[in-house]
């Protein structure tokens, strides 16, 4: 016996109770591929979640996080509280970055400032809680015999850095 279900398009399900007739997905459900024997329940964006895309008969709803939270996990499966720049989220809430560390985003952890001397550089601008150190020229560039001229043009333009 030929499986008639394979003919059922997305947005429908193959209704065994009705001789394998393709029936539309009921309200608040969807099927994103053809040949489905059931429709999946639509995701509901409640609480800290807000709807980014409404559920349709062929695709699930997509959620975002409400203001003050950001998405984590595949398809925004969780919402995590935002902190301010210069902070990180701990079990006790948002805490300022310790001296010598920074976080330039509302999420994630505080990271150590770059140690310019490890890369053979001097410090141009000190770091803050919100921003990394900016390293400057190498000590060799600052010695009495160093040339002041700008080096030859690079092979490519420098990439866009935040301003």
């Amino acid at each position: 016996l030929q499986d008639l279900c394979s003919n059922c398009p997305a947005g429908t399900f193959c209704d065994n109770n009705r001789s394998q007739i393709c029936s539309p997905c009921p309200p608040n459900s969807f099927s994103s591929a053809g040949g489905q024997r059931t429709c999946d329940i639509c995701r509901q964006c409640k609480g800290v979640f807000k709807t980014r895309k409404e559920c349709s008969s062929t695709s699930n709803a997509e959620c975002d996080c409400i203001s003050g939270y950001h998405c984590l996990g595949a398809e925004c499966s969780m919402c995590e509280q935002d902190c301010k720049q210069g902070q990180e989220l701990t079990k006790k809430g948002c805490k300022d970055c310790c001296f010598g560390t920074f976080n330039d985003q509302k999420r994630g952890i505080c990271r150590p400032w770059t140690n310019c001397s490890l890369d053979g550089k001097s410090v141009l601008v000190n770091g803050t809680k919100e921003r990394d150190v900016v390293c400057g020229p190498s000590p060799a560039d600052l010695s009495p015999g160093a040339s002041s001229a700008t080096p030859p043009a690079p092979a490519r333009e420098p990439g866009h850095s935040p301003q």
């Epitope: 150190v133 900016v134 990439g159």
Partner: nanobody, 125 residues
Framework: QVQLQESGGGLVQAGDSLRLSCAAS????????MGWYRQAPGKQRELVAS????????NYADSVKGRFTISRDNAKNTMYLQMNSLKPEDTAVYYC??????????????????WGQGTQVTVSS
């Protein structure tokens, strides 16, 4: 590529003021920080003052704190160094410097350090 051109140097008396300018051209959007360095004859080049182009945060060498002020006009792509109460020990060639990456960013084929040609400041007693 970024080009830097200093101006405003000269010969002044101790106690006088001068304002240096550094005009940037080229890929100025990529500059994250700028600074003024100075080099007296036979001495190492030293950082005088620096500034973040975005938020205007500044750093100063102890020897110039309270006398020098670094500032920038992003619309004009120009950085300034206002030098007050000048002393003979401030005599040096002053160089403009620009940096196009946070941390010690380095990528093959990319320049991150740019210097101007320098402007002479001489303070007589």
């Amino acid at each position: 590529q970024v080009q830097l051109q200093e101006s405003g140097g000269g010969l002044v008396q101790a106690g006088d003021s001068l304002r240096l300018s550094c005009a940037a051209s080229g890929s100025t959007f990529s500059i994250v920080a700028m600074g003024w360095y100075r080099q007296a004859p036979g001495k190492q080049r030293e950082l005088v003052a620096s500034i973040i182009t975005g938020d205007g945060d500044t750093n100063y060498a102890d020897s110039v704190k309270g006398r020098f002020t670094i500032s920038r006009d992003n619309a004009k792509n120009t950085m300034y160094l206002q030098m007050n109460s000048l002393k003979p020990e401030d005599t040096a060639v002053y160089y403009c410097y620009a940096r196009t990456g946070y941390g010690s960013s380095w990528l093959m084929g990319h320049e991150y350090d740019y210097w101007g040609q320098g402007t002479q400041v001489t303070v007589s007693s």
